[in-house]
Interface confidence: medium
């Protein structure tokens, strides 16, 4: 005979589970239905009655199938300075992020309470770590045959250009000056930009059946002017 | 305008528990952190913790943790705190104040103060 | 735990005369450029009230005689002429990592 589906709420059989988006109720001993993503529980379930969900509120949300008496509050309104990268509905928390040119440099759960600047490498320096989300660029003095003449957060040493006859030897921030019309070989025009860093932060989700703890808002601090860094700068 | 309106005096036996409350108006609650400072009669400030109404999430120093609980009640944007196995060293006033979670990161309105009498 | 330090712990300052609080910290309470440290104002029976965060900025409402200035680990708030109602305690505060700590308190008196 096949197994009968049980309809919610049912007593699960002695050492099994209750069955996906299903969870089990302690004070019925029985397993009930979960509410779907949006929605919250607004009536526990009884030994004759199952859950009853209700729709999350304005500014409020939930993620994951659940059981929670009430729907976990979306983050911070982002600051004037950030992108709000995901908006707030009722399936998902809002997320601001850093916006371009910019890092997380001090947070907490909540998100990131100070966005700052990424380090610019003035020239003579080219950048050796490119900035992610929460770490700022690192800059290195260019090596013997490598040059860097702009101040970026984003260019990295490039080589001199070899020439048939140098008129100008170049350095750590300038290129050699060729005599000849045309060098024997050089770099194509233009800057070697390492790319910006690009968000890879992962929407916080709350377990079930406890809301999350962690919203993962992030929050801008205007800045005030930075100390320039060796080989950087806070312009 | 903001404001934060803290319970009122309290008096406890050694050994026994409090809870403090703080109601929030003029902001959105969920939106900053309310933190917990206490100051014994004549002495300086102490940070006890903070939370975050939103989440949920705490804050401790690790002086009071185990001892210490701080919750909120978003629905009516109150926010307590509550100390347990008191002793008379914990006789104080029971401060609770709001910092921004962006922008000046300090206590910029405070409660008026609860006053703790631990004694037997 | 970051301790701070704040030096004189009295102060006796003649009305329209400057007044100078240090604030010295275990360990440098600077991020990215910014300072984590901020002046309150305590007066007797009364909570404590902003005055300057992030080392220099003025609180709203505020009287300007107020300023606040350092970096790092050594800060300064100035009273640039102290007025009658200024008598109080002052505290500094960092809050660049947990747990948040406060100064002893300086005490300024009229002399």
């Known amino acids: 005979l096949p197994a009968q589906v049980a309809f919610t709420p049912y007593a699960p059989e002695p050492g099994s589970t209750c069955r996906l988006r299903e969870y089990y109720d302690q004070t019925a001993q029985m397993c009930c239905s979960k509410c779907s993503p949006g929605q919250h529980a607004k009536v526990f379930c009884t030994k004759t009655s199952d859950t009853v969900c209700d729709s999350c509120e304005d500014s409020t949300y939930t993620q994951l199938w659940n059981w929670v008496p009430e729907c976990l509050s979306c983050g911070s309104r982002c600051s004037s300075d950030q992108v709000e990268t995901q908006a707030c509905t009722r399936e998902q928390n809002r997320i601001c992020t850093c916006r371009p040119g910019w890092y997380c440099a001090l947070s907490k759960q909540e998100g990131c309470r100070l966005c700052a600047p990424l380090r610019k490498c003035r020239p003579g320096f080219g950048v050796a770590r490119p900035g992610t989300e929460t770490s700022d660029v690192v800059c290195k003095p260019c090596a013997p045959g490598t040059f860097s003449n702009t101040t970026s957060s984003t260019d990295i040493c490039r080589p001199h250009q070899i020439c048939n006859v140098v008129a100008i030897p170049g350095n750590a921030s300038m290129d050699a000056v060729c005599t000849s019309t045309s060098p024997t070989r050089s770099m194509a025009p233009g800057a070697v930009h390492l790319p910006q860093p690009v968000s890879t932060r992962s929407q916080h989700t709350q377990p079930t059946p406890e809301p999350s703890t962690a919203p993962s808002t992030s929050f801008l601090l205007p800045m005030g002017p930075s100390p320039p860094a060796e080989g950087s700068t806070g312009d | 305008q903001v404001q934060l309106v803290q319970s009122g005096a309290e008096v406890k036996k050694p050994g026994a528990s409090v809870k403090v409350s703080c109601k929030a108006s003029?902001?959105?609650?969920?939106?900053?952190?309310i933190d917990w400072v206490r100051q014994a009669t004549g002495q300086g400030l102490e940070w006890i913790g903070e939370?975050?109404?939103?989440?949920?999430?705490?804050y401790y120093n690790e002086k009071f943790k185990g001892r210490a609980t701080l919750t909120a009640n978003k629905s009516i944007s109150t926010a307590y705190m509550e100390l347990s196995s008191l002793r008379s060293e914990d006789t104080a006033v029971y401060f609770c104040a709001r910092s921004q979670v962006y922008g000046k990161i300090a206590m910029d309105h405070w409660g008026q103060g609860t006053l703790v009498t631990v004694s037997s | 735990d970051i301790v701070m330090t704040q030096s004189p712990d009295s102060l006796a300052v003649s009305l329209g005369e400057r007044a100078t609080i240090n604030c010295r910290a275990s360990?440098?309470?600077?991020?990215?450029?910014?300072?984590?440290m901020h002046w309150y104002q305590q007066k007797p029976g009364q909570p404590p009230k902003l005055l300057i965060y992030?080392?220099?900025n003025l609180e709203s409402g505020v009287p300007d005689r107020f300023s606040g200035s350092g970096a790092g680990t050594d800060f300064t708030l100035t009273i640039s002429s102290l007025q009658a109602e200024d008598v109080a305690v002052y505290y500094c505060?960092?809050?660049?990592?947990?747990?948040?700590?406060f100064g002893q308190g300086t005490k300024v008196e009229i002399k």
């Open positions: 992030r080392a220099s």
């Open positions: 939370i975050y109404p939103g989440s949920g999430n705490t």
């Open positions: 003029g902001y959105t609650f969920t939106d900053d952190y």
């Open positions: 505060q960092q809050s660049k990592e947990d747990p948040y700590t």
């Open positions: 360990e440098s309470v600077d991020n990215s450029g910014n300072s984590f």
